[in-house]
Every structure is written in structure tokens, then in C-alpha cells.
């Protein structure tokens, strides 16, 4: 027998789905509307039949009372070709929701986006999070989104992404985004980050995370930064191959004032780069391959730094040379 | 809403918006006020998830919080002018990116800065 | 925004203008604030609320904007507010007073 596709726990809280079959039986979802937490996944399936069965263009107002019943808060749904009128059929019924956290992933948005909606309201969401999914739409999906989702998003987190560079001219500026999260775009760069960091659309941010998203210098990336005018307090480099030298030709970037948080670990460093703030709360320099403790004079005035797993901290290691075993780090690295 | 009605000059404003028939995780509220015979002027908001914006003219004195449970919106806006005189609107915001507007308000809670 | 003020009578058709600083993209709201209480007329330059009657409208781009009402009732006698909505701080104009002649 197949096991089912659906499980809710015994809280109620949480309700996962697998829809592995071809011809998955989709009222199977139904068994999740008293949880808070649902997941469903599509086992890659093209969604386009379901258009023939259901009527994206339809006035959403007719479902808001279900909707408005329903406990989720936080909705991830996973890999599918989703027609991009299905996507916003969803979202437009969504609205009506207590939703407040939405992740996609592994997702294949195919066909264009329809026009602006006549109703002016939106998905409240706090958090949008999308993960390897694509767009037929290019650069201009970002802007698109948008058109269905209320201004007060906080959290929006972008990995994985096929374009991730956006066409800023679209792009309505996100007022309320304290926490911007580009990692795991190895291929976006400095300059990249240039071309997602659209100017004046991010105003509020707070937090900015680019781990291994293919950055080379603290400078760099303060660069793109000042550029783009964006402020963070915390800004998460880790997980990038960092030189530690600048380009002597580059000019030198003042950081903001407002950065007080940078976490350069697991970034390959030999020595303490050059152009780092002068003044930090929190410096994370662990878990890379400093050979020798870094000299005050090249540190930032620092509250609270680390230093963990780097070679001069463990007994009888000496800096790791290409191909040599010895990785120089200690275990938790 | 409800506030004070009269305040000495130096002293803070605490209003509080009540609202019924929607739920805060849903709506953003705006606080607008208007001078006497004057025009309007946007304060700040306090958005679906919590965050706040505020008019950069008031961000050192201005301070939106709510309660979502008790479907209250409070304002607090301290060292109080004259100036600061006038009728203070709680606004609903709705739309999404493009379509945003204020589409209900409050019926005003009238302010008067005097020693 | 212009005029501050404007005498017309019943049946008429007026038109109040507002004038950006710069392109705002059509993030252009209208108002009406009849005494006390205020509520939205248009959204999106030229987008209805509901409930509102058919003899408002709005049109422009760019940097200018208006709002047009075409067959005057009592109930209209109100000023009028618009406001931009393409950045924060959001701001209004400086309203026009319609009065009844």
C-alpha cells in the first residue's frame, strides 16, 4: 500500500504533504486546515491541468470567509511547474488568510504574470522566502510579486535565484524590509550585488546576509553597499572566498556608521583583510586559516570578537597548504 | 481613538486606536493629523508585521506601537509645541505595492497644546 | 495642488489639479473630506473605491494629476486632498475647498 501523502501531527500544528504520484489525489491537502504549519511538496508535477480545473480569474472575495478560518501561518510549497496565473489565483485568495510566512522552492514559474489586479489589497505576509525558483518573466519578477503582496514585508529571502539581479526601474521600494537575505547565489558578485541592491528601494534594512554568494573583499561589497545607500547593522560575509588585499587602484569605502555586526567566517582568510570599519560590536572571524593571532593594529575596535577554529589556535597545526590533510581547522570548523 | 484633549506644552501625547471589523496582522495603520484649517500631514505607520515607519519631521519624538490581541493601535509623540495642535486621524492603509491607500479613518481626536 | 478654493454650482463639472515635483509613476490617491471624517475617492490615478459614485473620475501621469467631478451634487461640497504614494513619507496637498455657489 502507499503510505499517505499527507501527515498532520498529533498537535495539529504542523502538516506536511508528498505528492509522489502521478495523478496525486489533491483533497488528500484537506486533513492540513486545522494546522499552523503546511508544507507541500509536488514531486516536481506540472500544475498547469489544475487551470482547467479551477478559476484563477475568479472574485476571491467568495472564499474569504473559508480562508479567513483557516490556522496557517506559515505555507511552504515546493516543487512544481506552477502556471504563474495559478500562482497569483493563490495569492489573491491568500489574501483573505491569517498567513504571515510564505516559502517556495524548487518551483518553475511558467507564463507571464496578469495585469495589476483591480482589487487594491494584498497578501499581508511578514516573510517571503523563495529558493531555486524560476521566472518566464526574467528580471522583472520581483516587481511583479509585488503587485500582490502589502507593503509591510520584513523578511525577504532570495537563494538559489536564476536572476538574481532585478529590474529596479519596476521594483517599488520595500519600506518595511528590515532583513534582506541574497545567500547562496554563488554566481552574484560584487557586481551582482550591485544590480540586486537596488538603490533606494531597500531603505529600512537591518540585516544583510550574502553567504556564498561569490564576494571577494569586505571593500567590495562596501562598495556596492554605499552605492546602493543601504545601511545594515549586521552584515553576514561568511562562507565567500575573501581576499584579504584590496586592489590598490580601488578607492578606499567609507563603511556606514550603522554597521556594528560582520561575520567574515568560514571565508578562507590568511590574515585580516584590509578596509574592515574601524569601529565593530561583533567581528566573527572564526573557522578560518589565520596562522597567527591578528595584531591589534589590524583589527577594528571590536566589543566582542572570534577567533575560533583558526590554525594558531590549535596546538602542533600549521597553515594548510593546497593538497596537504592537514585542513588546520579544529573540528567544529 | 481616544487622547487627552489638552496638553501643556512639553508634555507627551498618548492616543489610542481601537478598531473593529479587521485584524491588525492584516491592515496597516497610519496616524494622519491636521492642523487647524491646514492641510494633512502623515505621522508614520505601524505595518501588519510590526515593523514602523515614521515621517523623518517626527522620528525623534514619535513612537507607534499595537497590540494585535486587543486590536489597538497606540501613539505617543513627546515634547509637545503648540505647533503640535490639531485634529489626529487613525487610518487604515490597504492595498498591495502599487495600489496602497487609506481606506478608512478614524473620526479624529482633537489635540489642543496650551499652557 | 490648485485651486485652494472654488465656487461652482449644482450640475456643474469641476477639476482639481495636483502637480508632482517629480514623475510619480501614477502613485496618486484622492480624498474627500466632507467635515470632519475623510474617505478615499480614487487610487491609482484613475481607479475607483468602492462605493463611490461614477461622476468622479482621475486621470494624468508624469508629474500632473486631476481629479474631475461631472455633475455636481450637494453631497460634494467637501475639500479635496491628493496625495502622492510612490515614496515615504507619504505626503498630501494642500487641499481645495469646493463651495457651493
Known amino acids: 500500500t502507499t503510505p499517505e501523502p499527507c501527515e498532520l501531527d498529533d498537535e495539529d500544528f504542523r502538516c506536511v504533504c508528498n505528492f509522489s504520484e502521478p495523478q496525486p489525489d489533491w483533497s488528500e491537502a484537506f486533513q492540513c486546515v486545522s494546522a499552523v504549519e503546511v508544507e507541500i511538496h509536488a514531486g516536481g508535477l506540472n500544475l498547469e491541468p489544475f487551470l482547467k480545473r479551477v478559476d484563477a480569474d475568479a472574485d476571491p472575495r467568495q472564499y474569504a470567509d473559508t480562508v479567513k478560518a483557516l490556522r496557517v501561518r506559515r505555507l511552504t510549497v515546493g516543487a512544481a511547474q506552477v502556471p504563474a496565473q495559478l500562482l497569483v489565483g493563490a495569492l489573491r485568495v491568500l489574501a483573505y488568510s491569517r498567513l504571515k510566512e510564505l516559502t517556495l522552492e524548487d518551483l518553475k514559474i511558467t507564463g507571464t504574470m496578469p495585469p495589476l489586479p483591480l482589487e487594491a489589497t494584498g497578501l499581508a505576509l511578514s516573510s517571503l522566502r523563495l529558493r531555486n525558483v524560476s521566472w518566464a518573466t526574467g528580471r522583472s519578477w520581483l516587481a511583479e510579486l509585488q503587485q500582490w503582496l502589502k507593503p509591510g514585508l520584513k523578511v525577504l529571502s532570495i537563494a538559489q535565484a536564476h536572476s538574481p539581479a532585478f529590474s529596479c526601474e519596476q521594483v517599488r521600494a520595500f519600506p518595511a524590509l528590515t532583513s534582506l537575505d541574497l545567500s547562496d547565489n554563488p554566481g552574484l558578485g560584487e557586481r551582482g550585488l550591485m544590480a540586486a541592491l537596488c538603490p533606494h528601494k531597500f531603505p529600512a534594512i537591518q540585516n544583510l546576509a550574502l553567504r556564498n554568494t561569490g564576494m571577494e573583499t569586505p571593500t567590495g561589497v562596501c562598495a556596492a553597499l554605499a552605492a546602493a545607500g543601504v545601511q545594515p547593522h549586521s552584515l553576514d560575509l561568511s562562507h565567500n572566498s575573501l581576499r584579504a588585499t584590496v586592489n590598490p587602484s580601488a578607492p578606499r569605502c567609507m563603511w556606514s556608521s550603522a554597521l556594528n555586526s560582520l561575520n567574515l567566517s568560514f571565508a578562507g582568510l590568511e590574515q585580516v583583510p584590509k578596509g574592515l570599519p574601524a569601529k565593530l560590536r561583533v567581528l566573527d572571524l572564526s573557522c578560518n586559516r589565520l596562522n597567527r593571532a591578528p595584531q591589534p593594529d589590524e583589527l577594528p575596535e571590536v566589543d566582542n570578537l572570534t577567533l575560533d577554529g583558526n590554525p594558531f589556535l590549535v596546538p602542533g597545526t600549521a597553515l594548510p597548504h593546497e593538497g596537504s590533510m592537514n585542513s588546520g581547522v579544529v573540528p567544529a570548523c | 481613538e481616544s487622547g487627552p484633549g489638552l496638553v501643556a506644552p512639553s508634555q507627551s501625547l498618548s492616543i489610542t486606536c481601537t478598531v473593529s471589523?479587521?485584524?491588525?496582522?492584516?491592515?496597516?495603520i497610519s496616524w494622519i493629523r491636521q492642523p487647524p484649517g491646514k492641510g494633512l500631514e502623515w505621522l508614520g505607520v505601524?505595518?501588519?508585521?510590526?515593523?514602523?515607519n515614521y515621517n523623518s519631521a517626527f522620528m525623534s519624538r514619535l513612537s507607534i506601537t499595537k497590540d494585535n490581541s486587543e486590536s489597538q493601535v497606540f501613539l505617543k509623540m513627546n515634547g509637545l509645541q503648540t505647533d503640535d495642535t490639531g485634529i489626529y486621524y487613525c487610518?487604515?492603509?490597504?492595498?498591495?505595492?502599487?495600489?496602497?491607500?487609506?481606506?478608512?479613518w478614524g473620526q479624529g481626536t482633537t489635540l489642543t497644546v496650551s499652557s | 495642488q490648485t485651486p485652494s478654493s472654488l465656487s461652482a454650482s449644482l450640475g456643474d463639472r469641476v477639476t482639481i489639479s495636483c502637480r508632482a515635483s517629480?514623475?510619480?509613476?501614477?502613485?496618486l490617491n484622492w480624498y474627500q473630506q466632507p467635515g470632519g471624517t475623510v474617505k478615499v475617492l480614487i487610487y491609482y490615478t484613475s481607479r475607483l473605491h468602492s462605493g463611490v459614485p461614477s461622476r468622479f473620475s482621475g486621470s494624468g501621469s508624469g508629474t500632473d494629476y486631476s481629479l474631475t467631478i461631472s455633475n455636481l451634487e450637494q453631497e460634494d461640497f467637501a475639500t479635496y486632498f491628493c496625495q502622492r504614494g510612490d515614496t515615504l513619507p507619504w505626503t498630501f496637498g494642500g487641499g481645495t475647498k469646493l463651495e457651493i455657489k
Open positions: 517629480q514623475d510619480i509613476k501614477n502613485y
Open positions: 505601524i505595518w501588519t508585521s510590526g515593523g514602523t
Open positions: 487610518v487604515r492603509g490597504d492595498g498591495n505595492f502599487y495600489l496602497y491607500n487609506f481606506d478608512y
Open positions: 471589523g479587521f485584524s491588525l496582522t492584516n491592515y496597516d
